[in-house]
Interface confidence: low
Amino acid sequence: FKVATPYSLYVCPEGQNVTLTCRLLGPVDKGHDVTFYKTWYRSSRGEVQTCSERRPIRNLTFQDLHLHHGGHQAANTSHDLAQRHGLESASDHHGNFSITMRNLTLLDSGLYCCLVVEIRHHHSEHRVHGAMELQVQTGKDAPSNCVVYPSSSQDSENITAA
């Protein structure tokens, strides 16, 4: 399987909410011995590999934000800890998973990584990640709503997030 990032860049005004999204692509084993972890963290564009550095999002580690379930089951973070920090991660039946950040500040700007780990009990684990940039802007140049830029080069038209 692979992870797709529908949007590579999110440009948002301060105070807005944003939902960063990743999508699990390809065949997903739904067997009893397969479990999926999905999570989010901040990183930097390293020389060797993007997303190798794992930093917290608003002081929450990716352990705090993780979802675990089998196959394409739905899940979301219900614990108060994340919500107190204005964060919620969620996953649906179709392989989409996301993190919602509320009341953005300039400090939220940076590189965000989604990580999926497929664990096959007694066998191995397989990890894939996706990266996207969040730019939080203030002042007269800031957009009135979040503007997202598709990852694919052939589809460069801006899409305004709902």
Epitope: G46, Q49, E53, R54, F62, I119, H121, S124, E125, R127
Partner: antibody
């Protein structure tokens, strides 16, 4: 601060079994992979297997398959490693190790080690 | 299984020296490579994770590089407390495997 505290040294006869415990404190237990790594005298590090308590099932190195059992008790935040059919070459220090990164196998927390001596 | 081969198996160096230890994987492991330091009678200590990320609390004289199959641990200026055995470890796939170790001794 996470701490892993292991049970004390053991002296065992060949053919018997040993069960070593590893109690975690200072952090959540269930979602983190706990591994067992052994080191024979003067030798290198050897991964035996690991368990993610929330999943309940363990993952073993082929070399130990059928002879090692790794379990976890979420209620006491304790992981166990049982090795059966002991032989002299199993004499080693056995470490439990854990990652800060949940399911991963980057070991930034280690127990103090448990010396298991197999001798007739 | 993924085999990890370290070189050299031992080396002698002086305080202040620049020391380089290499680790080679039998197949590509991307950057899923960690380095540990172990002193006699003690548990290993994580120095570098993800090939090049410095573990919190580890002095900046330690650095890691590489990707794929070839990796390097560098100590830019060896200190007295750095004399120890160093291990690489891949966590790309289970079974987890370690290199055989490199003992850094005082010249």
């Amino acid at each position: 601060q996470v701490q892993l505290v292991q049970s004390g040294a053991e002296v065992k006869k060949p053919g018997s079994s040993v069960k070593v415990s590893c109690k975690a404190s200072g952090g959540t237990f269930s979602s983190y992979a706990i591994s067992w790594v052994r080191q024979a005298p003067g030798q290198g590090l050897e991964w035996m297997g690991g368990i993610i308590p929330i999943f309940g099932t363990a993952n073993y190195a082929q070399k130990f398959q059928g002879r090692v059992t790794i379990t976890a008790d979420e209620s006491t935040s304790t992981a166990y490693m049982e090795l059966s059919s002991l032989r002299s070459e199993d004499t080693a220090v056995y470490y439990c190790a854990r990652s800060s990164y949940g399911w991963s196998y980057e070991f930034d927390y280690w127990g103090q080690g448990t010396l298991v001596t197999v001798s007739s | 299984d993924i085999q990890m081969t370290q070189s050299p198996s031992s080396l002698s160096a002086s305080v202040g020296d620049r020391v380089t230890i290499t680790c080679r994987a039998s197949q590509s492991i991307n950057n899923d490579l960690n380095w540990y330091q172990q002193k006699p009678g003690k548990a290993p200590k994580l120095l570098i994770y993800a090939a090049s990320s410095l573990q919190s609390g580890v002095p900046s004289r330690f650095s890691g590089s590489g990707s794929g199959t070839d990796f390097t641990l560098t100590i830019s200026s060896l200190q007295p407390e750095d004399f120890a055995t160093y291990y690489c470890q891949q966590n790309r796939a289970t079974p987890i495997t370690f290199g055989q170790g490199t003992k850094v001794e005082i010249k």
